[in-house]
Amino acid sequence: NIDVCKLGTVTVQPAPVIPLGSAANISCSLNPKQGCSHYPSSNELILLKFVNDVLVENLHGKKVHDHTGHSSTFQVTNLSLGMTLFVCKLNCSNSQKKPPVPVCGVEISVGVAPEPPQNISCVQEGENGTVACSWNSGKVTYLKTNYTLQLSGPNNLTCQKQCFSDNRQNCNRLDLGINLSPDLAESRFIVRVTAINDLGNSSSLPHTFTFLDIVIPLPPWDIRINFLNASGSRGTLQWEDEGQVVLNQLRYQPLNSTSWNMVNATNAKGKYDLRDLRPFTEYEFQISSKLHLSGGSWSNWSESLRTRTPEEEPVGILDIWYMKQDIDYDRQQISLFWKSLNPSEARGKILHYQVTLQEVTKKTTLQNTTRHTSWTRVIPRTGAWTASVSAANSKGASAPTHINIVDLCGTGLLAPHQVSAKSENMDNILVTWQPPKKADSAVREYIVEWRALQPGSITKFPPHWLRIPPDNMSALISENIKPYICYEIRVHALSESQGGCSSIRGDSKHKAPVSGPHITAITEKKERLFISWTHIPFPEQRGCILHYRIYWKERDSTAQPELCEIQYRRSQNSHPISSLQPRVTYVLWMTAVTAAGESPQGNEREFCPQGKAN
C-alpha cells in the first residue's frame, strides 16, 4: 500500500486513464536529498507492475529515459482492460542485503469511451406510479461511467437524474421518481440518456412517447363473483380498477383445464356478466386492464380468484344394469347396478339415488333411496318388472332411467354368435361377435359384461359393463382390466322384452401358470381311474387357462409319458382315464396351459390299478 509518497513522486503521461491499445509513460522521481546515502549514482529506480495485487512484471527493461540517481521514465504498453497498479521502488545497488524501498505508486485505468445508450424503454406502473426507464448501455467501459437520464415534456420542463456504472455496480435503469398524470394524456415526452466517462461521452437517440404509451395500469384487485339466484351457470364478476381504465380482458377456466376462455369488456366499470359457467366446478378467474382502446399496454393479470360455482340439478341419464338370481321356485333376487354420473352431468354432490322396482300389471311398487351405486331386492318370479333410478343433489333430481327386467340369457335365439376376445395390450381386451341368427325380435342394444374369474367375485364385486348400439359388433373393454387375470365376458343381446347371451373367457396379457393343478385323489371305479384335483390358486394362473394335461408313465420307466388333454372348465375337478394296465405302478401328474405356454408339473402321485383294464 502506497499511503504517503515520502521519497518521491510518480506521474503518468498522457493521463492515468487511457484508451485500450494506448501506451503510457510513467515517470518516477526522487525528492531532493532522498535516495541511497553517500552514493547518489548508485540510486536505481525500478518499476513493478501489479494486477489484482499480484506482481506480474518488473519493467526494468522498459526505461526510455534515465537521470541517473534522480528519475527514470518507463514506457508501458499492451495494458489490459481495467486497473493496473505500478509501484516505483528504489534499489541501492551497493547494498545487496537490503530489499528495494517503495517510493510511490500510480494506478492506470484502461477502458473505452461509452457507446450511445440504446433501446430506451420507459414505464409507469399505475396512474400513481413513477416513471422508470431502462436502456442498453452497450459494451462494458471498464471505467466509472456516469449516466444522465433526461425527460423533457410540456410546460418547458425537463427533469433529469443520474447514476453511474463501475466494476461494482451497473447503471442501466433509473426511476425518475416522478408521476405523469392523466391530464397529460395528449402530451408528448422526449427522453434521452447521456453517458460520460474520462475517455468520452455519447448520447442516445431521443425516444418519444406519450402518457398512454408508457403507463401500464395496475392489475385489477378485490375480485369477487356473485351467482344470480345461486345459479351454477350465471355469475357477475366484479373488481376494482384504476379510474382511467376503459378496456378489460377477462380470462377464466375450470381448474383442471388447459385452455382459457377469453372475454374483452369495454367500459365494464368493474362488472361483467358471465353466462356459460359449468355448475359445481372449481374455476379460476383473472382480469387485466388497459387505459386506451387502441394504444397503451395491458396490465399484468390480476391475482386469481378461485371459487366453485353453485350446484344445479343433475342432468343426463344413469347407465343401469342388473343381475337376476333365482332363489327358489317363486322368488328371485334382483341386483341393480348403475354408474356414477360424470361431474358435468351430476352438477353437484350426489346425495342419494332414488330406486324404484315396479311390477307392470299388478302395479306393485318398491321404492327406496340409497347412497350406494347398487341395490338388491327379493321379488316374486312372476310378473313383468321394470326398474328406474334417478340421482339427486341439493338442487334436485335427474330424470329417472328405466330398464325392463328380463331373463338375460333366457332366449337362445337372441344369443350372439362367434364371440371372441383378443388381448389388445396390457390393459384392454377387444371383444367381437356376430348378431343372433334367428332372433324373432329386433335387438335394441348389446351389453358387454365382464368380471374377474376369481373366488367370490360374483358376490364381492359388481360387474363392469358397456352398452353397445345394435349396429356395432365389437367393444374394447378397459375398465378394471389388469394383466395376467382371466375375465368372464358375456355379450348380451337385449330386445324389448327378452335377452340372450353368449359367454367367453379372455385376458389382456398372459404367462404360463406358476404351477400345475394339485392331484388330490386317484380312485378306481368300474375299471376306470378317476383323477381328482384342486385348481391352481387364482394369483398363480396368470391368465386364462385353456386346458389341463394329465400325464402318466410307469414308475422307473424312461419312456416318454402319455398324456390326456382336457378342455378347462371351472366347474370340473375330476376326469377319468382308462388306458392303464392293472397291477402296474404308475406315476401321474398334471399341468395347466395358457396361451403363453405350459406350467411346471404339479405334485406327483403313484397309483397301481387293481382291476382288469381295457
Epitope: T130, C159, K161, G177, N179, S181
Partner: nanobody, 129 residues
C-alpha cells in the same frame, strides 16, 4: 419558525457565473421538494429549477436554463445551491428559494408556486452587458 435565507446574488458581467445558496432553518427539508424561482420587474414569478425530494432527488429545469443552471443540495447542512453559468442579461431577476413539506412526484406540480409552502426573501442577480 421556518426560515429560508438566500445569498450569493450580485452584479455580474454577461457570460459570467454565480453560485446562489439557500439555507433552511427551523426545519429539515432534506427529503422534501425544494426549488428556485425568479421574478424580473413587471413579470410573474417563474420556476427555474427544482429537486423532487423523492429517493435520489430528480432535478427539474425550465428549458430556458437547461445546461447553464445546476441545482444541488447538501442534506446534512440543510442547504440548497443554484450554480449559474454563462449568465445572460435576460437572467436578471430576484431569485427566490422555495421549500415544500412533502415530496413532489407529479410532473405537473413541480413548477407550480402553490406546491411550495415556504419562501425566502430573495436575492438580486443583475447581469450587465
Amino acid at each position: 419558525q421556518v426560515q429560508l435565507q438566500e445569498s450569493g446574488g450580485g452584479l455580474v458581467q454577461d457570460g459570467g457565473s454565480l453560485r446562489l445558496s439557500c439555507a433552511a432553518s427551523g426545519r429539515t427539508f432534506s427529503n422534501y421538494a425544494m426549488a428556485w424561482f425568479r421574478q424580473a420587474p413587471g413579470t410573474e414569478r417563474e420556476f427555474v429549477a427544482g429537486l423532487s425530494g423523492s429517493g435520489g432527488d430528480t432535478a427539474f429545469y425550465d428549458n430556458s436554463v437547461m445546461g447553464r443552471f445546476t441545482i444541488s443540495r447538501d442534506s446534512a447542512k440543510n442547504t440548497m445551491w443554484l450554480q449559474i453559468n454563462n449568465l445572460k442579461p435576460e437572467d436578471t431577476a430576484v431569485y427566490y428559494c422555495a421549500a415544500a413539506t412533502h415530496v413532489v412526484v407529479s410532473y405537473g406540480l413541480v413548477r407550480k408556486r402553490g406546491t411550495y409552502d415556504y419562501w425566502g426573501q430573495g436575492t438580486q442577480v443583475t447581469v450587465s452587458s
